[in-house]
Structures are given as structure tokens and as C-alpha cells.
């Protein structure tokens, strides 16, 4: 004869474990039903009655089958430098990630606890390593023959234009200015090219350098201060 299917609560056979989506209640000494995700145990089982489950209260959740007396509280609303990539529901916690132009300076199990603005490389410096979701931009001085005239977290050092006749020589923060109307563009040695789009500029007009100041990138971290990386803007 096939073994009879036991209905919860039931006493397990000695040495055996409870089935999937059941748990062993030490007090009742019975196998009892777990509550589904989005619920919690309102009343624990006894020898004669099974677990009574109830929906999670507002702003709380359970992600797994469980027998917890209270659902877990969702994390705080996402801050202004974050975007909510997963909403708080009865079955899942809220997940906040950093918005574009920011990176995660202090992560948590899921999402980000603290976002910080990506470092901006000032004129004379270009992006050596672009920022990622979890790492800041690394700036480097523009090598001879290259320049960057922007304060940017994405712009790299670009080669100076090659002039037939140079009116003003280029430097690390300014392109060369030609007297000729038909300059040629050259790949100067040491020019860094990162896999990202570079905005096109007119080759015939002298670029107006942008202000060398950038918004403050200071933020609070639970650690001591560290000096800003060379070529980055700071306080």
C-alpha cells in the first residue's frame, strides 16, 4: 500500500525531516506549514492546528517561504542621488541604485547605501579610467601633443591639431591654433582613446575654455579624508 500523505501539522518519523515548505516547530514538536513570500506567521502551529499566515503589513516584506512572526521592514525611500530600480512590495525589498553621473561609494547587500558624484577631470587632465557603477573616474595629465579643455567625468585627452603654420602652440589644456585654414588632424603619441563617444568640435574656431571650477564632489563617508586624485576637482 502507498504511504498515506500526511497533512500538517504532523509528527515526523524519527530521524526524518519535514517536507519542502514545512518547518519543524520545536514547541509543538510537529511539522507545520511555512508561510509563502509576502506573508508571515500570525499564529504558530500547535499539535492540532496549522500555522496561520497573514499578509505583510505596509512597507514590509518576506522574500522566502518562512515562519517569521513579523515581516522585514523595507529600506528607506531612495535619496535624490538614487533611482529606485526595485520597488518595495510584500515579496521584495526596495533596491536603490545610483543615478547617472554618480557611483556607489558604499554598497549594501542589494543596491547602494551611499552614492557619490563621479570625479570630474579638470582642464589639462583627461579620463584615464572611466567611472563604473562602483568605482570613481581616474584622471591623468594629458601627455605632450594632447589636451583637454573641459571639466568632465567622460572626456579624454585628445590630440592637438597639426598646423601648417602654428599661431598659438597647444598645451595640455588648449588645442593648437593654426594660421592656415586647413589644419590636419593627427594622432599624437600618447593620445588616450577610451571606448566612448567624443563630442566633435569645429576645427576652424578657437575653443573657449570652460570654467575650471566644478560642483563640489564632497560627500560623507565613514572613513578618514583622503587627498583628491591628481587632476580632479574638489573642494
Amino acid at each position: 500500500l502507498p504511504a498515506q500523505v500526511a497533512f500538517t501539522p504532523y509528527a515526523p518519523e524519527p530521524g526524518s525531516t519535514c517536507r519542502l515548505r514545512e518547518y519543524y516547530d520545536q514547541t509543538a514538536q510537529m511539522c507545520c506549514s511555512k508561510c509563502s513570500p509576502g506573508q508571515h506567521a500570525k499564529v504558530f502551529c500547535t499539535k492540532t492546528s496549522d500555522t496561520v499566515c497573514d499578509s505583510c503589513e505596509d512597507s514590509t516584506y518576506t522574500q522566502l517561504w518562512n515562519w517569521v512572526p513579523e515581516c522585514l521592514s523595507c529600506g528607506s525611500r531612495c535619496s535624490s542621488d538614487q533611482v529606485e530600480t526595485q520597488a518595495c512590495t510584500r515579496e521584495q525589498n526596495r533596491i536603490c541604485t545610483c543615478r547617472p553621473g554618480w557611483y556607489c561609494a558604499l554598497s549594501k547587500q542589494e543596491g547602494c547605501r551611499l552614492c557619490a558624484p563621479l570625479r570630474k577631470c579638470r582642464p589639462g587632465f583627461g579620463v584615464a579610467r572611466p567611472g563604473t557603477e562602483t568605482s570613481d573616474v581616474v584622471c591623468k595629465p594629458c601627455a605632450p601633443g594632447t589636451f583637454s579643455n573641459t571639466t568632465s567625468s567622460t572626456d579624454i585627452c585628445r590630440p592637438h591639431q597639426i598646423c601648417n603654420v602654428v599661431a598659438i602652440p597647444g598645451n595640455a589644456s588648449m588645442d593648437a591654433v593654426c594660421t592656415s585654414t586647413s589644419p590636419t588632424r593627427s594622432m599624437a603619441p600618447g593620445a588616450v582613446h577610451l571606448p566612448q563617444p567624443v563630442s566633435t568640435r569645429s576645427q576652424h574656431t578657437q575653443p573657449t575654455p570652460e570654467p575650471s571650477t566644478a560642483p563640489s564632489t564632497s560627500f560623507l563617508l565613514p572613513m578618514g579624508p583622503s587627498p583628491p586624485a591628481e587632476g580632479s576637482t574638489g573642494d
Partner: antibody, heavy 120, light 108 residues
Framework: QVQLVQSGAEVKKPGASVKVSCKAS????????MHWVRQAPGQGLEWIGR????????KHDPKFQDRVTMTSDTSTNTVYMELSSLRSEDTAVYYC?????????????WGQGTLVTVSS | DIQMTQSPSSLSASVGDRVTITCTAS???????LHWYQQKPGKAPKLWIY???NLPSGVPSRFSGSGSGTDFTLTISSLQPEDFATYYC?????????FGQGTKVEIK
């Protein structure tokens, strides 16, 4: 845009019942709660109860235990609050307000209010 | 029930003044569950500060909120004519959810 539009003013006699409606538009009724809050003339705000329109589950202040009934009609995105055995101290403006699940009960949109006057 | 007590019940202030309203809970309230509403005469309340210190869009930055446990404050750094209204604190920590009695900010 999000809107909560309530039914018009009511005048009732003591002992009667009143049913106030609140029609929601501009958002999905899933994963939100609809609350009822009242304000007696010249007084502060008093929470009556709330309903989960998707499930019909309700919760209310025990002081209204036997007198308040909250229901929802998902086909019309309308919630209702019925208060029975009215007495003069129930004279108030009754507001519906919503709070999205996960926003810790912050009521971000309110109806315009419904004045209920209880007078013999 | 958690009782919410606001002080003062009313205050008179001038444009440009710094104003602080306090809200004291009879038992501890998680900061996520403490909100403030602004109400003007004849109008429905508006959510003004959520989760103790966060401003919904459209609320001027001269408003701020702080606190934890049983003591919470709403501060207006420089009172403007449009700020004259009644402010209510609200706890959603434990049912039944309750409001403070309100603080009326009047023109001096």
C-alpha cells in the same frame, strides 16, 4: 495625473448612515492603500481606517469598530466608507487619501473632502 | 495607541523668522514612519515632509525635518507669507495611526 474625487456634501439625522465615495484616477489601484481621515469643524485630523482596494482587506481605529465599513469596487476604481449610527459629533469633513505600498504610510494625494453634517 | 503631541499649538511669527515645531510621541516611532502635513483653511492637507526629513517635490527647501525615537521637529528656516498654515505630524508606526493636534502658524 493622480486625482481622488469624492462625493458631495451630505446632511443626515442622528442614527442614520452615510456612505461617502472616492473615485481614483491616474494610477493603478494595485499596491496602494486608501485611507479615510476626518476633521471636525475647527479640529485636527483623525484617522478612521484604510482599505487595500485590490484585496478588500481593511483596518480601522477600534473606536469606529462597529460603525465603519470600507469597501472597494475595482471595476470603477472607487472606494467607499460607510459610517452608521451617526451622532452630532460625527459632523466633519471626511477625506480619502492614498498611500503607496512601501512609502511607510505617507499619504501623498488627498480627495477634496466631503462635508457630512449630522443634525436633527 | 501612540499619542502625538505637538508644541506649540499655535505661534505668531513674522516673515523671515526661523520657526520650529516639535512633535513628541508617547512611545518610540521609527523615523521612516513619521510624516508632516500642511493644511490651509478650507483645503485638504498636503504631504509636506515624509519619513522624518524628506521633502516631496514642490516643497521649498527652507523646510526641513529631523528627529528620532519620540522627538521630531519641523523647521522653517525663513518664514514666507505662503507658509502660514496648520502643520500636523503623523505616525504610521503602529495602528491605529495617529496625528498630532496641529500647530497653527499665524502672521504676527
Amino acid at each position: 495625473q493622480v486625482q481622488l474625487v469624492q462625493s458631495g456634501a451630505e446632511v443626515k439625522k442622528p442614527g442614520a448612515s452615510v456612505k461617502v465615495s472616492c473615485k481614483a484616477s491616474g494610477f493603478n489601484n494595485k499596491d496602494i492603500y486608501m485611507h479615510w481621515v476626518r476633521q471636525a469643524p475647527g479640529q485636527g485630523l483623525e484617522w478612521i481606517g484604510r482599505i487595500d482596494p485590490a484585496t478588500g482587506n481593511t483596518k480601522h481605529d477600534p473606536k469606529f469598530q462597529d460603525r465603519v465599513t470600507m469597501t472597494s469596487d475595482t471595476s470603477t476604481n472607487t472606494v467607499y466608507m460607510e459610517l452608521s449610527s451617526l451622532r452630532s459629533e460625527d459632523t466633519a469633513v471626511y477625506y480619502c487619501a492614498r498611500s503607496p505600498y512601501g512609502d511607510f504610510g505617507a499619504m501623498d494625494y488627498w480627495g477634496q473632502g466631503t462635508l457630512v453634517t449630522v443634525s436633527s | 495607541d501612540i499619542q502625538m503631541t505637538q508644541s506649540p499649538s499655535s505661534l505668531s511669527a513674522s516673515v523671515g523668522d526661523r520657526v520650529t515645531i516639535t512633535c513628541t510621541a508617547s512611545s518610540s516611532v521609527s523615523s521612516n514612519y513619521l510624516h508632516w502635513y500642511q493644511q490651509k483653511p478650507g483645503k485638504a492637507p498636503k504631504l509636506w515632509i515624509y519619513s522624518t526629513s524628506n521633502l516631496p517635490s514642490g516643497v521649498p527647501s527652507r523646510f526641513s525635518g529631523s528627529g528620532s525615537g519620540t522627538d521630531f521637529t519641523l523647521t522653517i528656516s525663513s518664514l514666507q507669507p505662503e507658509d502660514f498654515a496648520t502643520y500636523y505630524c503623523h505616525q504610521y508606526h503602529r495602528s491605529p495611526w495617529t496625528f498630532g493636534q496641529g500647530t497653527k502658524v499665524e502672521i504676527k
